[in-house]
C-alpha cells in the first residue's frame, strides 16, 4: 500500500531571465527512492539515480542544473517555459509517486510564490 | 571502454537447458540495471528479461516467463539468464544490454548464439 | 502491452536524401521512447533516446521528436554507413517492446 505524499512548491511563478528552484519532498513511507525524474510536459529535463548520479537532456544542459537535493534549478528563464512540471518519485516497494509543479514565468519583476500543495 | 562480453550458447535439444551468461567490464556494473533482448534469424528485436540495480527486482516477457531466470553477481560483474524448457522458438541471438536510468539501452555485447532442434 | 507500429517497413533512398522513419505506439509513452541502428551481423547501436536527446558519439544528421503516441527518426543526410536496419522502442512499461524495424537500403 503506498502510504506516501509529494509536498511541492506549488504553483509559482519567476521573472523572464531568472532562475527558479523546483523542489519536490517525498514523506510518510519508509520506501526506498531509487530514481527521481523531472519532466516538463512530454520532454525529459534530468534524471537523478540512487546510484548513477544525475542525467541531464542534453537539449536543457544550458539552462538546467541538479539541485538542490532531488530538486532542479531551472535558469535563464523564459516565457516558452512557463507550464507544468512533474517530478516523479520511483520507490521500492511502493511504486512510483508524482507531483506536479505549475510554473509561470512573468515578463515584469512581479513574481510570487503560490502556496505549497500535496498530492498523495 | 565500457564492453559486455555472451558466453554459453550453442545447440541444445527441445526441453533442454542452457545458462548464457554476460561479463561486464569499464564500468561501475553493480550501478546499472541490466537486459536480455534477442533476434530470431532474420527477424526484429525481442526483449525477453531485465533486473534492475538498485532492488535487484527482474522483469520477463511472458513468452518466457516461467522458464527464464535473470540474475546477477555485483562480485563478478556479470549477469546471466538460466533458460529451462528451451523450445524452437526460442532459438536466437541473445544480447546483453546495459540500461542506465531504465529508461534506455546504451551498451550492448556481441550475441551469442542459442539453437534449439533436435 | 504496448504496440509499437514502423513504417516503412523498408525505404530506398540515395546518399544525401533526407529519410524520415515514424513510430506509433498503441498507447501514450510520453518520452520513453529509444531508436536504434543495426547493421548485419552487428549488435544494435543506440542513436536517440527519450524521444529527442542524441546519444554522445552519434552523427547530429540523426535526431528524434515527437511525444505520446507519435514519433519521428529522422536522418538530415543520408551517408554511407546508415544502411542499416533501424528499430524504435517503448520504455515507459514491462513488457519493453520494439518496433518491428524499417530496413534502410540504396536506391
Known amino acids: 500500500m503506498m502510504t506516501g505524499t509529494i509536498e511541492t512548491t506549488g504553483n509559482i511563478s519567476a521573472e523572464k531571465g531568472g532562475s527558479i528552484i523546483l523542489q519536490c519532498h517525498l514523506s510518510s513511507t519508509t520506501a526506498q527512492v531509487t530514481q527521481v525524474n523531472w519532466e516538463q510536459q512530454d520532454q525529459l529535463l534530468a534524471i537523478c539515480n540512487a546510484d548513477l548520479g544525475w542525467h541531464i537532456s542534453p537539449s536543457f544542459k544550458d539552462r538546467v542544473a541538479p539541485g538542490p537535493g532531488l530538486g532542479l534549478t531551472l535558469q535563464s528563464l523564459t516565457v516558452n517555459d512557463t507550464g507544468e512540471y512533474f517530478c516523479i518519485y520511483h520507490t521500492y516497494p511502493d511504486g512510483t509517486y508524482t507531483g506536479r509543479i505549475f510554473l509561470e514565468v512573468l515578463e515584469s519583476s512581479v513574481a510570487e510564490h503560490g502556496a505549497r500543495f500535496q498530492i498523495p | 571502454e565500457v564492453q559486455l562480453l555472451e558466453s554459453g550458447g550453442g545447440l541444445v535439444q527441445p526441453g533442454g537447458s542452457l545458462r548464457l551468461s554476460c561479463a561486464a567490464s569499464?564500468?561501475?556494473?553493480?550501478?546499472?540495471?541490466m537486459s536480455w533482448v534477442r533476434q530470431a534469424p532474420g527477424k526484429g528485436l525481442e526483449w525477453v528479461s531485465s533486473?534492475?540495480?538498485?532492488?535487484?527486482?527482474?522483469y520477463y516477457a511472458d513468452s518466457v516467463k516461467g522458464r527464464f531466470t535473470i540474475s546477477r553477481d555485483n562480485s563478478k560483474n556479470t549477469l546471466y539468464l538460466q533458460m529451462n524448457s528451451l523450445r524452437a522458438e526460442d532459438t536466437a541471438v541473445y544480447y546483453c544490454?546495459?540500461?542506465?536510468?531504465?529508461?534506455?539501452?546504451?551498451?550492448w555485447g556481441q550475441g551469442t548464439l542459442v539453437t534449439v532442434s533436435s | 502491452d504496448i504496440q509499437m507500429t514502423q513504417s516503412p517497413s523498408s525505404l530506398s533512398a540515395s546518399v544525401g536524401d533526407r529519410v524520415t522513419i515514424t513510430c506509433r505506439a498503441s498507447?501514450?509513452?510520453?518520452?520513453?521512447l529509444n531508436w536504434y541502428q543495426q547493421k548485419p551481423g552487428k549488435a544494435p547501436k543506440l542513436l536517440i533516446y527519450?524521444?529527442?536527446s542524441l546519444q554522445s558519439g552519434v552523427p547530429s544528421r540523426f535526431s528524434g521528436s515527437g511525444s505520446g503516441t507519435d514519433f519521428t527518426l529522422t536522418i538530415s543526410s543520408l551517408q554511407p554507413e546508415d544502411f542499416a536496419t533501424y528499430y524504435c522502442?517503448?520504455?515507459?512499461?514491462?513488457?519493453?517492446?520494439f518496433g518491428g524495424g524499417t530496413k534502410v537500403e540504396i536506391k
Open positions: 544490454a546495459r540500461e542506465p536510468y531504465d529508461v534506455w539501452m546504451d551498451y
Open positions: 569499464g564500468f561501475t556494473f553493480s550501478s546499472y540495471s
Open positions: 533486473i534492475s540495480s538498485n532492488t535487484g527486482t527482474s
Open positions: 498507447q501514450s509513452i510520453s518520452y520513453y
Open positions: 527519450a524521444a529527442s
Open positions: 522502442q517503448q520504455s515507459y512499461s514491462t513488457p519493453l517492446t
